[in-house]
């Protein structure tokens, strides 16, 4: 038994970091692998995380931790009941994949205005509550080509759009994803859709 | 209440052996780390070795490494030191402390908040 | 080896009077913000040493609130806003931030 490809880990700095590796054949990752992580700290303990299955040769492991800080380090042991297949370690403030937005909300009773909003995915005492931005898509049901992505540089979790840069009497649909700038983060998850029926009053034109 | 207990020490010769026990009671024994701490005749505090509280990660004073074994069983509650090649330098009151709770991720700091009423050791000839 | 310096060593104080420790690590012992591993303790005559201060600035359980400590990085006091006779005793500053762990020399504190 042997790893084809190395663990690779993300966290989402708050309580979860999730790694993901390939072995060289099918394998029963919960019964065979055990994954095993240790903070670098004074008097630390070795924790256990049990792999899941992530396709045939793959596993993906859901490390779990306490809120985490730049300074935190962590070995980690893959191991094969007795036999240790890899040795590696990971710094989770190098690799912060945040959390997905939730809650994602279109309100379209504001004056031919659409307010999108939804929730920052993480509580005010973390350290990227202040320092997500956001990208939200928008996207036509029925015309493909009828694709855009609004960059929300702001703190504040929403967007307002004018209804009429959408076209009427068409259903859309809208998610969200999240980064953060400070830690030079991979892109979240997109946010669950929501879909929305957009009209509006055309402009009354005088001739 | 929450309270440790020493015992084991003694007089020994130089070259001797002792075994320090610490009996802990009101706390979860097996979640905290601990830690002995000595102090010699007239002298100030000097940390001497620390255990995580699964018992799998060991620290020395390099004054002891070698020739002191710090160890635990978790069933009893007990916190051993292991004493060999005693070296008069040994002479000191061995306290054992509470140390961090170390089952958490990041092990949580409170200080050494619990002591021991503390066990002498005297090495002489 | 971090080394842990206190001064002064001795320090007379009348009655209701404020004192002040001062305890520098030779290397930094702040982990994260908030998390500076030093702690202050106290060992009156004949007994075992108690905690006073964790972390820097946190008081311990039962502790009086004329102790206070603060500081940062490698810099740290301990305050005593109003000393009190049962006070006296040694006073010694410890990190806990690597192995090993270090106690500074300690101070002892007696009344005028």
């Known amino acids: 038994m042997k790893v084809l490809q190395e663990p690779t880990c993300v966290s989402d700095y708050m309580s979860i970091s999730t790694c993901e590796w390939k072995m060289n054949g099918p394998t029963n990752c919960s019964t065979e692998l055990r994954l095993l992580y240790q903070l670098v700290f004074l008097l630390s303990e070795a924790h256990t995380c049990i792999p899941e299955n992530n396709g045939g040769a793959g596993c993906v492991c859901h490390l779990l931790m306490d809120d985490v800080v730049s300074a935190d380090n962590y070995t980690l042991d893959l191991w094969a009941g007795q036999q240790l297949l890899w040795k590696g370690s990971f710094k989770p403030s190098e690799h912060v994949k945040p959390r997905a937005p939730g809650n994602l909300t279109v309100h379209t009773n504001v004056s031919d205005t659409l307010l999108l909003t939804w929730s920052n995915p993480y509580p005010p005492d973390n350290y990227l509550y202040n320092h997500l931005t956001y990208a939200v898509n928008i996207w036509s049901e029925n015309d493909p080509a009828d694709f855009r992505i609004y960059n929300v540089t702001y703190l504040e979790p929403s967007l307002r759009i004018a209804a009429s840069t959408l076209k009427s009497g068409i259903s859309y649909r809208a998610r969200v994803r999240a980064w953060a700038q400070c830690y030079n983060t991979t892109w979240s998850e997109w946010s669950p859709s929501t879909k929305w029926h957009n009209s509006y009053r055309e402009p009354f034109e005088q001739h | 209440e929450v309270q440790l207990v020493e015992s084991g020490g003694g007089l020994e010769q130089p070259g001797g052996s002792l075994r320090l026990s610490c009996a802990g009671s009101?706390?979860?024994?097996?979640?905290?780390?601990m830690t002995w701490v000595r102090q010699a005749p007239g002298k100030g505090l000097e940390w001497v070795s620390s255990v995580s509280g699964d018992g799998g990660n060991t620290y020395y004073a390099d004054s002891v490494k070698g020739r002191f074994t710090i160890s635990r069983d978790n069933s009893k509650n007990t916190l051993y030191l292991q004493m060999n090649s005693l070296r008069a330098e040994d002479t000191a009151v061995y306290y054992c402390a509470k140390d961090r709770l170390s089952k958490t991720i990041r092990p949580r700091y409170y200080g050494l908040d619990v002591w021991g009423q503390g066990t002498t050791v005297t090495v002489s000839s | 080896d971090i080394v842990m310096t206190q001064s002064p060593l001795s320090l007379p104080v009348t009655p209701g009077e404020p004192a002040s420790i001062s305890c520098r690590s030779s290397?930094?012992?702040?982990?994260?913000?908030?998390?500076?591993?030093v702690d202050w303790y106290l060992q009156k005559s004949g007994q075992s040493p108690q905690l006073l201060i964790y972390l820097g600035n946190k008081r311990a359980s039962g502790v009086p609130d004329r102790f206070s400590g603060s500081g940062s990085g490698t810099d740290f006091t301990l305050k005593i806003s109003r000393v009190e006779a049962e006070d006296v005793g040694f006073y010694y500053c410890m990190q806990a931030y690597q192995s090993p762990y270090v106690f500074g020399q300690g101070t002892k504190l007696e009344i005028k």
């Open positions: 009101g706390f979860t024994f097996r979640d905290f780390a």
């Open positions: 290397q930094s012992v702040l982990y994260s913000i908030g998390y500076n591993y």
